[in-house]
């Protein structure tokens, strides 16, 4: 099985124990590590951070001791903006220039492939996204002709039904991608006005339609029915939780909220907590399991957080094995307890290790 793990370059800027550099990663933990994110400037793939080249080097030296490890560079992301991607993909010349710039950049910096993180193509970009993938793959095939190992091509796709329907021609893009990471998280957010788990495995009894589509099982099944081969589908598992501030004394699933949860000490983003911050939060919190959805949530005071733990990730891995998927994807290594100092287990990357162990289990 593949274990595809994202590392985010901005995690270097977190304070103190939250700061994560690629040299803190375990070279034997994942089969693929994806560095997020690269930029596109003047239609050419480019660095984003001032020290990306140094960090690329740090990441790719992990392969010295584990030659089986593959590294990919992810281009795009939330801050890149869908419109910018759209402009490049919809213009033949810009698209060509971008595609041509990729292989030399990846080879120069020691990456084994490219991950496309266009978040997200609009309904009018659907065809252009397909063309971008098809032409990128053709370029990778051509570039590998002189006996080089062919560069890998993957894409991170939304698990939201509306985005799947409007943005992706699943059957066509699947033909050209080496694997697809389906982002089976962020199904629920503060915009709903109520508490809810952002990455349920199954639809819960609490989920009235239209929430019937907001779960991992539906998204994976739908992708498969749309023509994604199970052998290319990698299922996303979050090492972060989504938090809410409760608006009343109700604390269950579907309880009213006044907004996102308070920012974490390190990640400093309202409504999001890294797993290592959740381990802190759990001291003195009340933990519940949403039985139908097979995921936990915890409450403390007026704070509510839905997250994944070692038990829920094992359920998810068993599910993806039952579905005969290609493996699991983790967003993100730097949100797991990468130092092993927060979750009291004397184990670095406890969630990712639980995923790895479950994948390896017979």
């Amino acid at each position: 099985y593949k274990l595809v793990c994202y590392y985010t370059s901005w995690s270097q800027y977190r304070e103190g124990d939250g700061s994560c550099f690629p040299d803190a990663l375990d070279r034997f933990l994942c089969t693929h590590i994806i560095y997020s994110f690269a930029n596109i400037s003047n239609d050419h793939i480019d660095t984003w951070e001032w020290n990306d080249v140094t960090l690329y080097g740090m990441l790719n030296t992990l392969k010295n001791r584990n030659p089986n490890l593959k590294t990919l560079l992810s281009v795009g992301g939330w801050n890149f903006g869908s419109q910018r991607f759209s402009k490049i993909a919809s213009n033949t010349q810009s698209r060509r220039t971008f595609i041509k710039s990729v292989p030399p950049f990846l080879r120069t910096h020691g990456f084994d492939g490219l991950d496309l993180a266009w978040l997200y193509p609009g309904r009018r970009d659907k065809q252009h996204f397909t063309t971008l993938i098809k032409e990128m793959k053709a370029e990778f095939i051509k570039e590998a002709q002189p006996g080089k190992k062919q560069l890998l091509l993957s894409a991170a796709l939304s698990a939201g039904k509306v985005t799947i329907d409007s943005s992706y021609d699943i059957a066509k893009i699947s033909q050209h991608l080496d694997f697809i990471s389906i982002m089976t998280y962020d199904f629920h957010g503060a915009w709903r006005g109520t508490t809810g788990h952002h990455s349920p495995l199954f639809r819960g009894q609490e989920d009235a339609s239209p929430d019937r589509f907001s779960n991992t099982d539906y998204a994976v099944g739908y992708m498969l029915r749309l023509g994604a081969p199970a052998s290319k589908l990698v299922m996303g598992i979050p090492t972060f939780g989504r938090s809410f501030t409760l608006a009343s004394s109700e604390t269950g699933v579907g309880a009213p909220i006044s907004g996102p949860g308070i920012p974490g000490r390190f990640t400093k983003e309202a409504g999001t907590l890294a797993y290592y911050e959740i381990c802190d939060f759990l001291r003195g919190a009340t933990v519940h399991r949403i039985l139908g959805q097979q995921v936990p949530y915890a409450t403390k005071g007026n704070q509510w957080v839905g997250y994944d733990d070692q038990e829920s990730v094992k359920s998810k891995v068993q599910y993806l094995k039952d579905r005969q998927l290609a493996g699991a994807m983790v967003w993100a290594l730097d949100l797991d307890d990468f130092q092993g100092s927060f979750c009291g287990q004397d184990l670095r990357f406890p969630l990712t290790n639980a995923i790895k162990d479950a994948l390896a289990a017979t």
Epitope: G122, R123, R124, V162, D165, S166, S209, P210, R225
Partner: antibody, heavy 122, light 108 residues
Framework: EVQLVQSGAGVKKPGATVKISCKVS????????MHWVQQAPGKGLEWMGL????????IYAEKFQGRVTITADTSTDTAYMELSSLRSEDTAVYYC???????????????WGQGTLVTVSS | SYELTQPPSVSVSPGQTASITCSGD??????ASWYQQKPGQSPVLVIY???KRPSGVPERFSGSTSGNTATLTISGTQAMDEAAYYC??????????FGGGTQLTVLG
């Protein structure tokens, strides 16, 4: 206020071609797909096809493929549906319909024209 | 042949609850929408995304979906609700498809 105003009723001979217009107001014409729906007398609704006014791209239902042409004129904010090789079973009310631009994926139609009756008779 | 199957007619007494069903394999994967059409008028959207009601549609109209069956429920049915009702869904293979329609008759 969103309005879709269609051209008037008409009688056509078998084998002829009919072209119906649908003029929109109250929203940006290029923001959303324009669909056409057929309703034969006493029968149900049947989706015929759509045009994306932004780029003129069309999708047609298999049943009407080859006989229907849907176009959009952005200079007048008007969509057109042309149906050729008319036969008696094409006698129907034809509606233009669109979905609100608030939705990224147009699963449904929340604005409809008043309908245009086309009678095919020799 | 319709991808979405509706009963041709449903009768209800005023003040009672009317339920109109729509079944089809695509509904397990797709949102259901419902339209009301009165004689000589254009269809009007009454439910979209399974359960959502456009502004201006009375609260007595509600929708639900379970498995491959969508249901339009009209509670406290009034004489003015007498009309034809059509379910509709989108699917990657069939594009936009309508059910055959159900004529709702309000007795009395």
């Amino acid at each position: 206020e969103v309005q879709l105003v269609q051209s008037g009723a008409g009688v056509k001979k078998p084998g002829a071609t009919v072209k119906i217009s649908c003029k929109v107001s109250g929203y940006t014409f290029t923001d959303y797909y324009m669909h056409w729906v057929q309703q034969a007398p006493g029968k149900g609704l049947e989706w015929m096809g759509l045009v994306d006014p932004e780029d003129g791209e069309t999708i047609y239902a298999e049943k009407f493929q080859g006989r229907v042409t849907i176009t959009a004129d952005t200079s007048t904010d008007t969509a057109y549906m042309e149906l050729s090789s008319l036969r008696s079973e094409d006698t129907a009310v034809y509606y233009c319909a669109t979905a609100s631009p608030r939705e990224e994926m147009p699963y449904y139609f929340d604005y409809w024209g008043q309908g245009t009756l086309v009678t095919v008779s020799s | 042949s319709y991808e979405l199957t509706q009963p041709p007619s449903v009768s209800v007494s005023p003040g009672q609850t009317a339920s109109i069903t729509c079944s089809g394999d695509i509904l397990a994967d797709q949102y259901a929408s419902w339209y009301q059409q009165k004689p000589g008028q254009s269809p009007v959207l009454v439910i979209y995304h399974d359960t959502k009601r456009p502004s201006g549609v009375p609260e007595r109209f509600s929708g639900s979906t379970s498995g491959n069956t969508a249901t339009l429920t009209i509670s406290g049915t009034q004489a003015m609700d007498e009309a034809a009702y059509y379910c509709q869904a989108w699917d990657i293979n069939t594009a936009w498809v309508f059910g055959g329609g159900t004529q709702l008759t309000v007795l009395g």
